[in-house]
Interface confidence: low
C-alpha cells in the first residue's frame, strides 16, 4: 500500500535533527575592525567619504573573534531558533584553494568554517561538513581545474583529495560527519555533451570520493574517530501505469541509472550496476547509442569498494515513469524514460509532487540493495511561495517525516538522521528556505521545533526526554576543543 | 605495468650513511604511500615506515626513529631512504613496497631489493 | 607492538596435501568490518608476493589453492594442492595500527 495511517512513536535518542545549507561563502575579514584597530576615525560623510584617523588617540583592543563575522552572527541566531542538532553546510573549495592546489591556501576562508563549526557546537549543534557542493549554476571548481576540463580531467580527482585531506587536517577535530561530494549523480545535467562525458565524469568523482575516503581512513580516522560518505540525489520512481511491465521496469531503471550507478560501486561491488552496463550495451549493439560506461580495472574496483561509513541520501519527491525508447548517446536518452506529471498530486511551485510515501520505500529499496547500514536524509524539503505562513512546507515535512518513522519503527531501517533542506532561501530562488533571504524567521520553524523537541510523533503520555548520555555525543571533546584550540 | 626500481648494492664502513632509492614507474606516484622494509639473513621481515609523496607525510616505526630517513621526490617518481651512523646490524636487504590504495594498507608492489653491507 | 606469532616454523608437506599454517595476532587486528592482517610468499633472493590481503582476499594472478581465513587475533592460510613451485617461506603481516609487523615466518618445504 502506498498511503498508510499515521504512526506514534519517537525517533531513538541519538537521532540527528539537522538542517542542511548548500554553499557558505567564506567572509573574507571579519567586520569588526575596530576591535583589532586602535585607532579613531572619523567618516568624511559629505566630503570625499573616507575615513580620517584621528592622531593622538588610542582605543582599547581585544583579539578577533568568531563573531566578528557578521554573517556567522546571522547564521547563529537562525539555528538557535531552529533548535537543530546539526548543521550540514558545504565549503567552497574554490575559496579555500584558489588556486587547486596547496600552493596557495586561503587560511582567513579555512578560520571562518572553523568559527562556523565552533560557534555551531557551543550551541550544541554539530555540523555536517560536506566538502564539495557543485550547483548547476556554477560548478564550484577552482578556476585552474575548471579551465582543465574540470572532471573530465582524472587529475581533478587527485586535486581534490589534496583539498580534502587539507579540511580533515584542519576541522577534522571539531567535525565528525563529513560529506565528501554533494549529488555527483546529477552532474549529468552539465557533463551532458555527451553519454561518454557524463559517465568520465562521474567515474572520476567516484574516484576522487574514494581517494579522500581513503586518505581520511588511513591518515585521520585513527585519533579524528568520525564518518565519511557522499550525498546522492535519491528521488523515488514509481511507473505512470502500474498496470503496465514496461513502466515498472522503468522505474527500476530509473533507481539503477540514478542511485545505484554510484551506490552499487562504493556500497556493494566495487564496479557499475550490471543493469545499467547491460543496458547501454544492448543500446549500443542496436546503433541507438554510442556510450559505454567506463571498464575499471581491479585496483580501481579495490579503490572503490567499500568506501562509505554511513548512506547519505538527499530526498525530494517521487517521479511517475513510462518507458520510451530514445536514441541517441546522452545518458538521459541512454535511459529510455519519460517522466509524467500527475496533475492530481499536491505540488510546489516549481512541480515537485508531495509523495511522503515515496521517501519510506526508498529506504526500503537501499536497505535491501546494499544492506544494513546507517542511513542519513542529508537534505529533503519542499519550495513554498509563502513567506510567513509556509503551510505546504509544515504538511511536507509532518508527513515525510511520519514515513521516515514507519520506516524505523515498522521496517527496522538504521535511519540516524533527516536534514531538512534548507536553513536560508536565496534570492531570485525557489523558496526552499526556513528563514526568507533578508533572514526572516516563516512558521514551518515552529512545527519543526515541536517534532525535534518531541523526537518524532509521541504517544500523549510517553516522554521525550533523553539522558546525557543516550543523546548524540559525536564530539564530547569537540567542545573542549573549541576553548582551548586557537581559532 | 607497475615497478619501483631500486638502486644497487651498497658497501659502506661503520658510522657512515648510505642513501637508497625507489623509482616508481607504472601509476601515478603521488597517490599511494611507499614503504620500506628491512631483511636480514635467517631473520624476518621488519616494517620500517612509510611516506605518502602526495604530501611528504611519513610515519616511523620506533625503533627506526633516528635511523632512517624517508623522502621522496614527485618530479623524478622517486623514493629515498637515508640509514645514518651505520653498524653491523644494519647490514641487511632493503625493499621498497608500494601499498595498494592505501585501503588495505597491504603490499603488492614490491622493488628487488637493494644489499646493504657494513663493514670495515 | 602488536606481536604475530606464525607456527610452525617449519612445514614439510607432500605434494597434492594440504599445508595449513597459523598466525596469531597479541591483539585484535580488526576493525570497522576489516580485518588487516596479510600473507605473503618469499622466495631467496627475491621479494615478497602478496597472496592474501584483508585475511581472505585473494590477490589478482595468485593460484585459488591458497585462502586465508580468521578475523581477530587468529588467522589461517590454507595451501591446497601444495606443488613443488610453493616451497618457500610464508609470512603474516598485520596494517591495524603502527607500528606494522610481520610474523616470524613459516618454511614450507615438499617432502
Known amino acids: 500500500k502506498e498511503s498508510t495511517p499515521d504512526v506514534q512513536g519517537q525517533f531513538p535518542c541519538d537521532f540527528s535533527w539537522g538542517v542542511t545549507e548548500s554553499v557558505l561563502k567564506p567572509e573574507s575579514v571579519a567586520s569588526s575592525p575596530q576591535f583589532s584597530d586602535p585607532h579613531l576615525y572619523v567618516w568624511n560623510a559629505t566630503g570625499n567619504r573616507l575615513l580620517h584617523r584621528v592622531e593622538g588617540v588610542r582605543l582599547k583592543t581585544r583579539p578577533a573573534q568568531c563573531t566578528d563575522f557578521v554573517n556567522i552572527k546571522k547564521q547563529l541566531e537562525m539555528l538557535a531558533r531552529m533548535k537543530v542538532t546539526h548543521y550540514r553546510f558545504a565549503l567552497d573549495w574554490a575559496s579555500v584553494l584558489p588556486t587547486g592546489n596547496l600552493s596557495a591556501v586561503n587560511r582567513q576562508a579555512l578560520r571562518y568554517y572553523r568559527c562556523v563549526v565552533s560557534e555551531g557546537l557551543k550551541l550544541g549543534i554539530s555540523a555536517m561538513v560536506t566538502l564539495y557542493y557543485p550547483t548547476h549554476a556554477h560548478l564550484g571548481l577552482p578556476e585552474p581545474l575548471l579551465h582543465a576540463d574540470g572532471w573530465l580531467n582524472p587529475s581533478t580527482a587527485e586535486a581534490f583529495q589534496a583539498y580534502a585531506g587539507l579540511c580533515f587536517q584542519e576541522l577534522g577535530d571539531l567535525v565528525k560527519l563529513w560529506i565528501t561530494i554533494n549529488e555527483p549523480n546529477r552532474l549529468s545535467d552539465i557533463y551532458n555533451r555527451s553519454g561518454n562525458d557524463t559517465y568520465g565524469a562521474a567515474h572520476n568523482l567516484l574516484v576522487a570520493h574514494a581517494l579522500a575516503w581513503r586518505l581520511y581512513d588511513r591518515q585521520f580516522r585513527p585519533s579524528q574517530r568520525g564518518a565519511v560518505s557522499l550525498s546522492l540525489h535519491a528521488d523515488w520512481a514509481e511507473p505512470a501505469n502500474p498496470y503496465a511491465d514496461s513502466h515498472w521496469r522503468a522505474a527500476e531503471r530509473f533507481l539503477q541509472f540514478e542511485i545505484a550507478w554510484f551506490a552499487e560501486p562504493l556500497f556493494k561491488t566495487g564496479d557499475y550496476p550490471a543493469a545499467m552496463r547491460e543496458y547501454i550495451a544492448s543500446k549500443h549493439r542496436r546503433g541507438l547509442s554510442s556510450s559505454a560506461l567506463p571498464r575499471l580495472t581491479e585496483a580501481e574496483r579495490r579503490l572503490l569498494k567499500g568506501t562509505v561509513d554511513f548512506c547519505a541520501l538527499n530526498h525530494f519527491t517521487t517521479r511517475f515513469v513510462m518507458h520510451e525508447q530514445l536514441a541517441g548517446s546522452r545518458y538521459d536518452s541512454d535511459r529510455d524514460i519519460q517522466f509524467l506529471q500527475d496533475i492530481t498530486r499536491l505540488s510546489s511551485p516549481t512541480r515537485l509532487a508531495v509523495i511522503p510515501w515515496g521517501v519510506r520505500k526508498l529506504l526500503r529499496w537501499v536497505r535491501r540493495n546494499y544492506g544494513d547500514m546507517d542511513i542519513y536524509i542529508t537534505a529533503s524539503g519542499i519550495d513554498d511561495q509563502a513567506l510567513e505562513d509556509d503551510r505546504l512546507r509544515k504538511y511536507y515535512l509532518g508527513k515525510y517525516l511520519q514515513e521516515v518513522l514507519k520506516a524505523y519503527l515498522i521496517d527496522k531501517v538504521r535511519i540516524k538522521g533527516y536534514y531538512a533542506f534548507k536553513l536560508a532561501e536565496e534570492k531570485s530562488k525557489p523558496r526552499f528556505g526556513f528563514f526568507t533571504s533578508d533572514f526572516k524567521a516563516k512558521s514551518s520553524i515552529q512545527f519543526y521545533n515541536k517534532v525535534i523537541s518531541s523526537r518524532g510523533f509521541p504517544f500523549e503520555n510517553s516522554s521525550s526526554r533523553c539522558s546525557q548520555t543516550q543523546e548524540n555525543t559525536e564530539c564530547t571533546v569537540c567542545l573542549f576543543l573549541v576553548q582551548k584550540k586557537p581559532l | 605495468q607497475v615497478q619501483l626500481q631500486q638502486s644497487g648494492p651498497e658497501l659502506v664502513k661503520p658510522g657512515a650513511l648510505v642513501k637508497i632509492s625507489c623509482k616508481a614507474s607504472g601509476y601515478t606516484f603521488t597517490r599511494y604511500d611507499i614503504n620500506w622494509v628491512k631483511k636480514r639473513p635467517g631473520q624476518g621481515l621488519e616494517w620500517i615506515g612509510w611516506?605518502?609523496?602526495?604530501?611528504?607525510?611519513?610515519k616511523y616505526n620506533e625503533k627506526f626513529k633516528g635511523k632512517a630517513t624517508l623522502t621522496a621526490d614527485k618530479s623524478s617518481s622517486t623514493a629515498y631512504m637515508q640509514l645514518s651512523s651505520l653498524t653491523s646490524e644494519n647490514s641487511a636487504v632493503y625493499f621498497c613496497?608500494?601499498?595498494?590504495?592505501?585501503?588495505?594498507?597491504?603490499?603488492?608492489?614490491w622493488g628487488q631489493g637493494t644489499l646493504v653491507t657494513v663493514s670495515a | 607492538d602488536i606481536v604475530l606469532t606464525q607456527s610452525p616454523a617449519s612445514l614439510p608437506v607432500s605434494l597434492g596435501q594440504r599445508a595449513t599454517i597459523s598466525c596469531r595476532a597479541s591483539k585484535s587486528v580488526s576493525t570497522s568490518g576489516y580485518s588487516y592482517l596479510h600473507w605473503y610468499q618469499q622466495k631467496p633472493g627475491q621479494p615478497p608476493k602478496l597472496l592474501i590481503y584483508?585475511?581472505?582476499n585473494l590477490e589478482s594472478g595468485v593460484p585459488a589453492r591458497f585462502s586465508g581465513s580468521g578475523s581477530g587475533t587468529d588467522f589461517t592460510l590454507n595451501i591446497h594442492p601444495v606443488e613443488e613451485e610453493d616451497a618457500a617461506t610464508y609470512y603474516c603481516q598485520h596494517s591495524g595500527e603502527l607500528p606494522y609487523t610481520f610474523g616470524g615466518g613459516t618454511k614450507l618445504e615438499i617432502k
Open positions: 611516506i605518502y609523496p602526495g604530501d611528504d607525510s611519513t
Open positions: 613496497a608500494r601499498s595498494d590504495y592505501y585501503g588495505s594498507r597491504s603490499f603488492v608492489y
Open positions: 584483508l585475511a581472505s
